[in-house]
């Protein structure tokens, strides 16, 4: 009796089970009662990453330098090219189809996590006792200067954007 379901790595066509093409190969012709499925390797710059019955291979992704992209991992007949962003940029999506400049943390905010090729800078507000007076993609919040350790006193209180100002202690006359 003709099959109604096929084994893994097979597909049903014309009431018979044919072998799927292995990753890196495309379908040329379905199997028959006399011949196996005919498959051909994908060409240069093409790939198929699953057992398949595709008649065309997929084109490798192009990492467009005009979009800030560069090749992180070259594609093979079985894998797509993986793109990442140039230094100072990160992907706008998981698919990494384009890049944007890393965000800088404004004064009053410090870098919690430095950006990577796939994730943006994560900023955090400087808590009490810390400050940031620059807009930066790398600088963390710095602790206020400890005047006491320098035998000085606070002349001007610090904020999240400014350090404390230390001065000499008032001398007893």
């Amino acid at each position: 009796e003709p099959p109604t379901a096929c084994r893994e790595k097979q597909y049903l066509i014309n009431s018979q089970c044919c072998s799927l093409c292995q990753p890196g190969q495309k379908l040329v012709s379905d199997c028959t009662e006399f011949t196996e499925t005919e498959c051909l390797p994908c060409g240069e710059s093409e790939f198929l990453d699953t057992w398949n019955r595709e008649t065309h291979c997929h084109q490798h992704k192009y990492c467009d330098p005009n979009l800030g992209l560069r090749v992180q991992q070259k594609g093979t007949s079985e894998t797509d090219t993986i793109c990442t962003c140039e230094e100072g940029w990160h992907c706008t999506s998981e698919a990494c189809e384009s890049c944007v400049l890393h965000r800088s943390c404004s004064p009053g905010f410090g870098v919690k996590q430095i950006a990577t090729g796939v994730s943006d800078t994560i900023c955090e507000p400087c808590p009490v006792g810390f400050f940031s007076n620059v807009s930066s993609a790398f600088e963390k919040c710095h602790p206020w200067t400890s005047c006491e350790t320098k035998d000085l006193v606070v002349q001007q209180a610090g904020t999240n954007k400014t350090d404390v100002v230390c001065g000499p202690q008032d001398r007893l006359r």
């Epitope: 009796e1 040329v28 012709s29 199997c31 028959t32 009662e33 006399f34 011949t35 196996e36 005919e38």
Partner: antibody
Framework: EVQLVESGGGLVKPGGSLRLSCAAS????????ISWVRQAPGKGLEWVSS????????YYPDNVKGRFTISRDNAKNSLYLQMNSLRAEDTAVYYC??????????WGQGTLVTVSS | EIVLTQSPATLSLSPGERATLSCRAS??????LHWYQQKPGQAPRLLIY???QSISGIPARFSGSGSGTDFTLTISSLEPEDFAVYYC?????????FGGGTKVEIK
């Protein structure tokens, strides 16, 4: 027991025609594709034609395409090969063979076709 | 068309010896190859299918190996009834083709 018995061979002049038959028994004929394979005297095996189990698909090599026609009658458990415009190089023993697991798993004993003037 | 080249054309051996027959395809055919044995005056008989799969009723001394373009039929210890002609056949694509055969004869 699977059996395939060929008949219809004989002597024929170049340009002539001949119809070979293959009678099958011992298995469900309509479930299997069948092929014809020939062997010229003292030579190797050469595939001639194949037909799918339902008879809807037929296959030929270029050297017999347009001259030979394969057919089957599942009700009669029979396979046929109509050979027209025969040439001296078609002289051979013709075997019918069942296709099981894409292999020719059972063969008949063959029938001799001689094309000569 | 896929061309199958069998070597050697003739193999002269004595009973009990090991026979190694080669079949080379002109392009890759994965494991889509069968082996047949033919004795004089008889029809061919299927020995091995899918390059290495054994057939019920065929003695265990017959084994097949290989994939891609290079295939081997091995007869581990020749019996008198093994002296015959052996053919490989590809079923990777149309047209179906056979190798030219290897004759295993008594030395």
């Amino acid at each position: 027991e699977v059996q395939l018995v060929e008949s219809g061979g004989g002597l024929v002049k170049p340009g002539g025609s001949l119809r070979l038959s293959c009678a099958a028994s011992g298995f469900t004929f309509s479930n299997y594709g069948i092929s014809w394979v020939r062997q010229a005297p003292g030579k190797g095996l050469e595939w001639v034609s194949s037909i799918s189990s339902g008879g809807d698909n037929t296959y030929y090599p270029d050297n017999v395409k347009g001259r030979f026609t394969i057919s089957r009658d599942n009700a009669k458990n029979s396979l046929y090969l109509q050979m027209n415009s025969l040439r001296a190089e078609d002289t051979a023993v013709y075997y019918c063979a069942r296709a099981g697991e894409k292999a020719m798993d059972y063969w008949g004993q063959g029938t001799l076709v001689t094309v000569s003037s | 068309e896929i061309v199958l080249t069998q070597s050697p054309a003739t193999l002269s051996l004595s009973p009990g010896e090991r026979a190694t027959l080669s079949c080379r395809a002109s392009q890759t055919i994965n494991n889509n190859l069968h082996w047949y044995q033919q004795k004089p005056g008889q029809a061919p008989r299927l020995l091995i299918y899918y390059a290495s799969q054994s057939i019920s009723g065929i003695p265990a001394r017959f084994s097949g190996s290989g994939s891609g373009t290079d295939f081997t039929l091995t007869i581990s210890s020749l019996e008198p009834e093994d002296f015959a002609v052996y053919y490989c056949q590809q079923f990777s694509s149309w047209p179906l083709t056979f190798g030219g055969g290897t004759k295993v004869e008594i030395k």
